[in-house]
Amino acid sequence: AVNGTSQFTCFYNSRANISCVWSQDGALQDTSCQVHAWPDRRRWNQTCELLPVSQASWACNLILGAPDSQKLTTVDIVTLRVLCREGVRWRVMAIQDFKPFENLRLMAPISLQVVHVETHRCNISWEISQASHYFERHLEFEARTLSPGHTWEEAPLLTLKQKQEWICLETLTPDTQYEFQVRVKPLQGEFTTWSPWSQPLAFRTKPAALGKDT
């Protein structure tokens, strides 16, 4: 038997993916474990094999269908179980009644691009990926800009409290290399969390014109 504290956390990407992480102190790395999804009002069941991501945690993705298909709604409840093999039998290690739209984590924004860049400002746009049409405009964003000599953790967060898939960065330094990231979060859901940060977009401001003040 496996002893120790266990944590089983899952998030729904709002379309066709439930990502799960199971942590168990003292669990065996070579044990075969599955996450089993049993919806209360759907005809399908789904499993995914947990793969080790660290000494005491495992992860997998329940892929429910094509990436942009709407597989669950706000009224669905999915019973999620972690089952691990013990000899010829399977033991339930963790269980939760999962409400997908209370546990949202969207995919990171994609397709970041510089729309327009000047000496002191830069206009950047992006797109959201695999986000449910249920949200309509009820999304918010956080953005951050990496300046030379700083870390991402030091970058101030810019908050966009509406579904605005662009930003105009101001007060930038001419002829300077920057990087930019953005993340998204639905307003819905008690346990909803921010998406991962987007891939960083590198850009450079234009040099100041010669003979002019900057």
């Epitope: 075969s32 599955q34 089993h36 399908w44 069941n45 789904q46 499993t47 995914c48 094999e49 793969l51 997998c60 892929i63 429910l64 269908g65 094509a66 990436p67 089952l83 399977w90």
Partner: nanobody
């Protein structure tokens, strides 16, 4: 709806090898635990091997362990059964099967079956 198409069967002498392939279309391949079953003339269909969605875990019926290897290529939407040291008792129609639920596929409960490919092992 998901479709499965097997290939690679044929006639082979005892001790020989064959590689069966099963290509999946119509759905997201990595959703599925994939399995091979076989049915010999006058016998019931039996489980041969399976591979989980990630490809990390494989399982076999005792009679083929050490001779057969199941694998999958998620980029090619294909599952394989490499059969070595074939024996006359391996003669059967081999079926590929898919289920999104790992716990159901072992009990012949598949979402979808292929049409089967004949493997004949002569002595």
């Amino acid at each position: 709806q998901v479709q499965l198409v097997e290939s690679g069967g044929g006639l082979v002498q005892a001790g020989g090898s064959l590689r069966l392939s099963c290509t999946v279309s119509g759905d997201v391949f990595v959703r599925y635990t994939m399995a091979w079953f076989r049915q010999a003339p006058g016998k019931e269909r039996e489980f041969v091997a399976l591979v989980t969605d990630s490809g990390r875990t494989t399982e076999y019926v005792d009679s083929v362990k050490g001779r057969f290897t199941v694998s999958r290529d998620n980029a090619k939407n294909t599952v394989y059964l490499q059969m070595n040291n074939l024996k006359p008792e391996d003669t059967a129609v081999y079926y590929c099967a898919a289920n999104t639920d790992y716990f159901r596929i072992r009990s012949l409960d598949a979402n979808t079956w292929g049409q089967g490919t004949q493997v004949t092992v002569s002595s």
